[in-house]
């Protein structure tokens, strides 16, 4: 629960949040996600770093790996083999991009309590995983895939053509990692470990982004990344499957691409194993409004994979792009051919559908003016999913169970009434066969993780309730938060307002708009956070508002696809509209309004500042996109089409920040970027700065040397301190 607010006599014992609190993470919370290893067992790393196995049914727990063993190789992560004979220990973690990293791996033999010697793994490894059954290993080293029958065996090399920045096997290149797969891996074991599927990405023809990494040497290093910007040559992807028992028999077999996809540029979007001999691949045209789901079967006689046209399912959007942020993935039922999938219904809301033969004959499972967000698990008799249906708040998430074994199927909200005030935003983690599950509540109160019986939904125990955090917050004057909506011209704008602790409607407060606003994003969520904006409200007396305008998610396709092919227009308009409505509320000092955002939010904040409305006194853009021609093809083209004359070049040119350089003359602008940003390249801010200089417009800027898109470590402290000074100066608040 949010700690109860104490008033009057006790109020003087309460203190406001400080910036130091935020930078030190004093009020961060913990979650508990069980590492499930069976229907009733899970692993968890204890406070003293032992790896402990818990059996829910016996109530017993025992240490399977001591902290001493972990420490002996400086392990920061572990993975138990499904046959429970081995554990891999991961150390020397070295981050690459958002998901990818390399590490050194040691294999510990639980049967004899020793590390496996002989045929040790090479280092550093780019990805490693156990087979789903037994203790086979697949790993990627120097862009090639290797297989081990058992940890002590010599490896079998599956691919030979891997080359840095050229050919990637079993791992994605930059753009697939960031914008399509959202993983560090691109290989998938079949359910019993018979086959291994993998992607090969050929980046040979992709233009390279190069930037300096200054380091400490006399000469800076140059970082080169094959990075396709909008309209550029894309990676060429191929999917292969190899028999892991007889890998040399016929070697890797390529899975055919559906003809309607292969006729022009395309993407591979995901792979889902159905059985050991049936696999489902999803493909997407480069113009991302057509997706094809293809179910392929192993032909024993030819040792090949057959993908009949009758098992191709097409998903097409006529009003926008296919899917939400990504095209949804199927969850197969026990018959191994029919599946459940989320896509838009006839009313333009994303809902669960059951597909047995064709998409046209799909049976709609959920419906209403709300959206199904995620399918967690399908069992013989139940389907568990999350949605924002409850009480019509799009920024909430509750977990539902639909009984699919009975007709008509009955629906039950598992979480809606558990801790109604404290918990309105849930996710879940299920054990095998959904025998048990963990619920993780993110707010709006203090987060709590609980364990539940999968049949009765009964709470078994609290896994993490953040008691220390609750106690620490008892003497803190937290801001008030409210989530409400504005109705403007048939558009519903949900907003979250963060108000100073002693908020008084009759007074005037400076307003800071925090914006992200990217397609299929959601900022107005019922989650707990004690962060920088909490401090700005608590200590500095600012009102902070977050607004979900057109282009944002989970409120239907009309709102979501409104920005299709027109990025940078309606997102900005809706922030401005909301600000005008906030002014009308009477407690905003209209001479002290600011806007800030990061990444896409930096783009929107820049455009809002340059909108010429006179509403904003100042604003901050952190690592902004400045022209869609500078950003990644996969992301950009999904929403904008191609930057060609016969497609959408005109709007690419019209939607740049640089084109509005003149309009920054009457605002205070702080532009911030990391020089080693692999995602939104420093180029974006360099071009804004150049345009402002050429227009003789004064502005403030800060770069962070050798920092990426996250501006982490010491840069974070410097960044928030710097932005705080800037805002306080803008709002004439004493330091």
């Amino acid at each position: 629960l949010r700690p109860s607010r104490v008033h009057n006599s006790e109020e003087n014992t309460m203190r406001a949040l400080t910036l130091k609190d935020i930078l030190n993470g004093t009020f961060s919370y913990k979650t508990f996600f069980p590492n499930w290893i069976s229907g009733q067992e899970y692993l968890h790393q204890s406070a003293d770093n032992n790896i402990v196995l818990y059996n829910i049914e016996t109530g017993q727990s025992y240490t399977i790996l001591s902290n001493r063993t972990m420490k002996s190789v400086n392990a920061s992560n572990y993975g138990l083999s499904p046959d429970r004979q081995f554990v891999y220990l991961e150390s020397d973690y070295s981050k690459l991009w958002r998901y990818s990293y390399t590490a050194t791996y040691y294999i510990y033999d639980l049967s004899n309590g020793e590390f496996v010697r002989g045929n040790e793994l090479p280092r550093p490894i780019q990805y490693l995983c156990w087979s789903p059954v037994g203790s086979k290993l697949a790993y990627v080293y120097q862009n090639n895939i290797y297989l081990k029958q058992r940890p002590g065996d010599p490896p079998f090399q599956i691919t030979f053509n891997g080359r840095e920045n050229k050919i990637f096997n079993g791992i994605p290149d930059w753009v697939y990692e960031e914008e399509m797969l959202a993983t560090k891996y691109a290989l998938w074991w079949s359910p019993n470990g018979k086959f291994l599927a993998y992607a090969e990405f050929n980046d040979t023809d992709i233009p390279v982004i190069a930037y300096s990494y200054y380091g400490d040497e006399q000469y800076p290093r140059t970082i080169n990344i094959p990075y396709p910007k909008a309209g550029a040559k894309n990676p060429v992807v191929r999917i292969f499957i190899i028999d892991t028992t007889y890998p040399a028999y016929v070697g890797p077999q390529e899975v055919p691409v559906p003809a309607m996809i292969a006729s022009s540029d395309y993407y591979f979007s995901w792979l889902t194993w159905v059985t050991d001999e049936r696999v489902c691949l999803q493909w997407l045209k480069r113009v991302q409004n057509v997706s094809v789901l293809s179910i392929c079967d192993f032909r024993e006689d030819w040792q090949t994979w057959d993908c009949p046209k009758t098992q191709e399912h097409i998903e097409e959007s006529r009003t926008g792009w296919a899917g939400g942020f990504f095209v949804s993935t199927p969850v197969f039922s026990y018959d191994a051919i029919s599946y459940y999938k989320i896509f838009s219904d006839k009313d333009g809301y994303k809902h669960i559908h059951y597909i047995k033969d064709t998409v046209e004959n799909a049976i709609q499972i959920t419906s209403g003016k709300w959206e199904a967000i995620n399918i967690f698990r399908v069992t013989q008799d139940s389907l568990f999913y999350s949605s924002n249906e409850f009480e019509e708040y799009p920024g909430r998430r509750n977990i539902y169970r639909i009984s699919i074994g009975s007709y008509p199927p009955s629906k039950k909200c598992v979480t809606c009434h558990l801790r109604k005030e404290r918990c309105q935003y849930y996710t879940a983690s299920f054990s095998d066969y959904a025998k048990y599950y963990a619920l993780v509540c993110y707010g709006p109160g203090i987060p709590i993780s609980t364990l539940h019986d999968g049949r009765t939904d009964q709470e078994i125990k609290i896994l993490e309730e953040n008691k220390e955090l609750e106690n620490a917050l008892k003497n803190i004057q937290l801001p008030k938060e409210e989530i409400k909506k504005l109705e403007v011209d048939e558009i519903t704008l949900w907003y979250k307002m963060i108000l100073p602790p002693q908020f008084d409607r009759s007074k005037k407060y400076p307003l800071l708009i925090q914006v992200y606003g990217g397609p299929c994003s959601q900022s107005v969520r019922s989650v707990f956070a004690v962060n920088w904006i909490s401090y700005l409200a608590s200590k500095e007396g600012m009102v902070i508002a977050l607004v979900d305008g057109r282009g944002t998610a989970f409120q239907g396709d009309k709102l979501l696809y409104a920005v299709y092919r027109k990025l940078g227009v309606y997102e900005v308009e809706d922030q401005i509209t909301a600000v005008r409505k906030f002014i009308e509320m009477g407690f905003i000092d209209e001479k002290r309004i600011a806007i800030w955002g990061w990444s896409y939010g930096g783009y929107v904040s820049s455009l809002a500042l340059a909108s010429g409305t006179g509403l904003f006194k100042c604003g901050i853009a952190v690592a902004p996109v400045s022209s869609w021609e500078y950003y990644a093809s996969v992301y950009t083209e999904r929403f904008m089409g191609l930057p060609t004359k016969d497609d959408n070049l005109e709007h690419y040119k019209n939607s740049t920040v640089m084109a509005r350089a003149e309009y920054f003359r009457n605002v205070d602008y702080l532009l911030i970027h990391g020089t080693a940003d692999d995602n939104v390249h420093f180029q974006n801010s360099a071009q804004i700065a150049k345009a402002l200089v050429n227009a003789q417009v004064d502005f403030q800027a800060m770069w962070y040397s050798d920092q990426n898109h996250g501006l982490s470590g010491l840069s974070t402290n410097h960044l928030y301190t710097h932005m705080t000074h800037f805002l306080k100066q803008c709002f004439s608040l004493s330091d």
């Epitope: 004979q85 037994g134 297989l147 029958q149 058992r150 065996d153 010599p154 079998f156 090399q157 030979f160 028992t245 007889y246 890998p247 040399a248 028999y249 016929v250 070697g251």
Partner: antibody, heavy 118, light 107 residues
Amino acid sequence: EVQLVESGGGLVQPGGSLRLSCAASGFTFRGYIMSWVRQAPGKGLEWVSWISPEGSRTGYADSVKGRFTISRDNSKNTLYLQMNSLRAEDTAVYYCARLLYGTWFDYWGQGTLVTVSS
Amino acid sequence: DIQMTQSPSSLSASVGDRVTITCRASQSISSYLNWYQQKPGKAPKLLIYAASSLQSGVPSRFSGSGSGTDFTLTISSLQPEDFATYYCQQATLLLPTFGQGTKVEIK
């Protein structure tokens, strides 16, 4: 330590039968392809047969197809070779070997001699 | 079936010599080529797998190279314990075949 120990060899008349056994230890037997390789006196190595980890798939050299049958009992960690209709040219030392990835023979037994003679 | 041809069938060499044995496949076998050492009355022993990977415990004086159809086993400095017969072997299409062997004798 991986160990493979063959047994069952001996003298048999042409047309006769013999069953070879190979007891495996020191590794997870049920996880590997196993094989028989033979070597006639003073000659080179000749692969005879292989069997998949679970025992459902087998392969045979043309020279023994239809006469020899490979099998395994994973509960006993034992590999077998049933040899029927034996011929003089089947005389050889028979080695039990682990066929890793169906590609290379990484561990071998010491061999058992089969002599087919009248 | 794929035929494997080894050459020479025998060779005489002295301790410390560099010895090279070649193996040719009748069709491409990628890098699925292995080398074994066999001493009289003993079982063969794996030396090199996948054309160039040294089996654990095998001295580093042994090395393998090649891909496609032509492969080589090299002993960089022959030791007394290396006098033996060497076999190459392939296993594409799950039909393993061996070369006829190369006998390395003391000069």
